[in-house]
């Protein structure tokens, strides 16, 4: 048993069919000695008396708010959360498998350039009696500062007979300098409390590893005379980091078809310009990604060619 | 990536080209590491990130932009010295710091490459034959060194007597190229930057 | 104490369905994920399906993926595996177990499927 | 499909010691624990080994598993001839849990 925060207590059970459980003793925070009574909940059941209660703690229905009270006066509150650890492996009942990148990604996290700022985002089924909490650091054995906002609901979406919910939270790194290299990974902690159930979730990644700049901005086209050629330009995003000589971005320019069967034509460049042809009903995108260290593509900046 | 590449104009900083081919000869060869060593630990999220340049040069600090100087995170200078004549420096007016930031790429990649040489000598005496260094990568580091042109100490090779450990010889690799890749970025983006300026 | 009963087992021509049972007891059935495994004449054991406490998500082997469907009625403490299309090489025995450091299996029960 | 390889057989005289290789990747016993099941002809596996090297009450002290990076083993020390079943070793992958991995199993023959 350990405490999340005051008085509130997360107990870590072997879950299986018959489990033992754990033995937990709740002390009544009270100078009083004599008279004292346990409830749990919402129930007026005395459960025991005494300044400690001793109980054995095996399922959902063994957690919850356990008060002390004295000649109907509440002295203190000890709220049990359960922490399920299945086949040596920490339950992840509440949030939902991303699978991308890869499998078992419960949080993903995406920069928008170097300055040591971050967001992080995860998804779940459930609806209500549900609280996050959001820590994070730069290295964990000899953690540097990192800080994080509350989490909040982003986005609701219909996926089949069910609604899925998204959170998102955003962090900065306290000291951050964008041209440094990274040694030490940045460590997010996710605490996420369903009813009686704990359960958390980390992910450890470098900036540089999350780098997913902003489309191009001021996409423009500029017809060449006599031809069905067109000169297309941009620019670097707002919000990509700066000298731009220095964080250099590479950028893909694609013509597209109305229909998505019609053949794709690419052309990369570290330019912000190109010359591309420009066929009836299509449109151009450009997108951009850190030239250097092949991180995520932006999502497409696009114009119709007509 | 496997993207069309443009040739750098000829009055171009003559050592952005050597740059490019660096980072693209340093990325090719950790892809390869680690698609050959897939039951090791090769992957950016296994290995422990280690410099072996660090508290020896100050790539990072000496090369900082301009516009970063102001930006106290990014001033946690190591005071090193190093020797200033350079031939990238030839065309330009160059400040203290630049010839500070040139010799100390120089410095990483004398040291890289030494350790890259050690290593290979290691790994070609692997019953195995798994992995060897690509000729590609040693001699791009060679062309960017020469292109740097810095009178410096040779650093002897070293020799081992034990008999190598090839597992712990391929993890070393793995980390060192991890390294390398980072610091091939950072010389990256040094050299577009010196040659905007 | 905690008991799985299995049902549903038998000779099914290939290409026909065939949906087993196990009925738990002794436990609160509602609180535990499930799984199914099979074991083919003379072979080792193979996982077939797994289903969450709350039926919430499923899993299958890639091998009946598509074809087998895992659900589970908590009001009846019952799971159940729907086997359709069956073919020769889904002839075994299948076990139901509980998810946990320390499980408890059903009794088995035999499927064949044969012409 | 098995991803967890076991030696075929194992066999020895009633009182050795005989040990049950399971060999896998860092996906799976490395990030993973392990448990080891008996199979009597006939009958549904008995779990002997959880977590790597922790007995349920039960199942006499003669077995004993470890696991060491991406290996795991069980032992049984002074054998018998009610021991003679087949073993399986099995954890989970870390890209595909819950679903449980098998080893390929293992038949022990108690000699004389």
């Known amino acids: 048993i350990w405490e999340l925060k005051k008085d509130v207590y997360v107990v870590e059970l072997d879950w299986y069919p018959d489990a033992p459980g754990e033995m937990v003793v709740l002390t009544c925070d009270t100078p009083e000695e004599d008279g004292i009574t346990w409830t749990l909940d919402q129930s007026s059941e005395v459960l025991g008396s005494g300044k400690t209660l001793t109980i054995q703690v095996k399922e959902f229905g063994d957690a919850g708010q356990y008060t002390c009270h004295k000649g109907g006066e509440v002295l203190s509150h000890s709220l049990l959360l359960l922490h399920k650890k299945e086949d040596g492996i920490w339950s992840t009942d509440i949030l939902k498998d991303q699978k991308e990148p890869k499998n078992k990604t419960f949080l993903r996290c995406e920069a928008k350039n170097y300055s040591g700022r971050f967001t992080c985002w995860w998804l779940t089924t459930i609806s209500t009696d549900l609280t996050f909490s959001v820590k994070s650091s730069r290295g964990s054995s000899d953690p540097q500062g990192v800080t994080c906002g509350a989490a909040t609901l982003s986005a609701e979406r219909v996926r089949g007979d069910n609604k899925e919910y998204e959170y998102s939270v955003e962090c900065q790194e306290d000291s951050a300098c964008p041209a440094a290299e990274e040694s030490l990974p940045i460590e997010v902690m996710v605490d996420a409390v369903h009813k009686l159930k704990y359960e958390n979730y980390t992910s450890s990644f470098f900036i540089r590893d999350i780098i997913k700049p902003d489309p191009p901005k001021n996409l423009q086209l500029k017809p060449l005379k006599n031809s069905r050629q067109v000169e297309v330009s941009w620019e670097y995003p707002d919000t990509w980091s700066t000298p731009h000589s220095y964080f250099s971005l590479t950028f893909c320019v694609q013509v597209q078809g109305k229909s998505k069967r019609e053949k794709k034509d690419r052309v990369f460049t570290d330019k912000t310009s190109a010359t591309v042809i420009c066929r009836k009903n299509a449109s151009i995108s450009v997108r951009a990604q850190d030239r250097y260290y092949s991180s995520s593509w932006s999502e497409w900046a696009s114009v119709p060619c007509s | 990536r496997n993207l069309p590449v443009a040739t750098p104009d000829p009055g171009m900083f003559p050592c952005l080209h050597h740059s490019q081919n660096l980072l693209r000869a340093v990325s090719n060869m950790l892809q390869k590491a680690r698609q050959t060593l897939e039951f090791y630990p090769c992957t950016s999220e296994e290995i422990d990130h280690e410099d072996i340049t660090k508290d020896k040069t100050s790539t990072v600090e000496a090369c900082l932009p301009l516009e970063l100087t102001k930006n106290e995170s990014c001033l946690n200078s190591r005071e090193t010295s190093f020797i200033t004549n350079g031939s990238c420096l030839a065309s330009r007016k160059t400040s203290f710091m630049m010839a500070l930031c040139l010799s100390s790429i120089y410095e990483d990649l004398k040291m890289y490459q030494v350790e890259f040489k050690t290593m290979n000598a290691k790994l070609l005496m692997d019953p195995k034959r798994q992995i060897f260094l690509d000729q590609n990568m040693l001699a791009v580091i060679d062309e960017l060194m020469q292109a740097l042109n810095f009178n410096s100490e040779t650093v002897p090779q070293k020799s081992s007597l034990e008999e190598p450990d090839f597992y712990k010889t391929k993890i070393k690799l793995c980390i060192l190229l991890h390294a390398f890749r980072i610091r091939a970025v950072t010389i990256d983006r040094v050299m577009s930057y010196l040659n905007a300026s | 104490q905690v008991q799985l009963v299995q049902s549903g087992g038998g000779v099914v021509q290939p290409g026909r369905s065939l949906r087993l049972s196990c009925a738990a007891s002794g436990f609160t059935f509602s609180s535990y994920g499930m799984h199914w495994v099979r074991q083919a004449p003379g072979k080792g054991l193979e996982w077939v399906a797994f289903?969450?406490?709350?039926?919430?998500?499923?899993y299958y082997a890639d091998s009946v993926k598509g074809r087998f469907t895992i659900s589970r009625d908590n009001s009846k403490n019952t799971l159940y595996l729907q086997m359709k299309s069956l073919r020769a090489e889904d002839t075994a025995v299948y076990y139901c177990?509980?998810?946990?450091?320390?499980?408890?299996w059903g009794q088995g029960t035999m499927v064949t499927v044969s012409s | 499909s098995y991803v967890l390889t076991q030696p075929p057989s194992v066999s020895g005289t009633p009182g050795q010691r005989v040990t049950i290789s399971c060999s896998g990747g860092r996906s799976n016993i490395g990030n993973n624990t392990v448990k080891w099941y008996q199979q009597l002809p006939g009958t549904a596996p008995k779990l002997l080994i959880y977590g790597n090297d922790q007995r349920p009450s039960g199942v006499p002290d003669r077995f004993s598993g470890s696991k060491s990076g991406t290996s795991a083993s069980l032992a049984i020390t002074g054998v018998q001839a009610e021991d003679e079943a087949d073993y399986y070793c099995q954890s989970y992958d870390r890209g595909t849990h819950p679903a449980l991995l098998f080893g390929t199993g293992t038949k022990v023959t108690v000699l004389g």
């Open positions: 177990k509980t998810h946990g450091s320390h499980d408890n």
């Open positions: 289903i969450r406490y709350d039926g919430s998500n499923k």
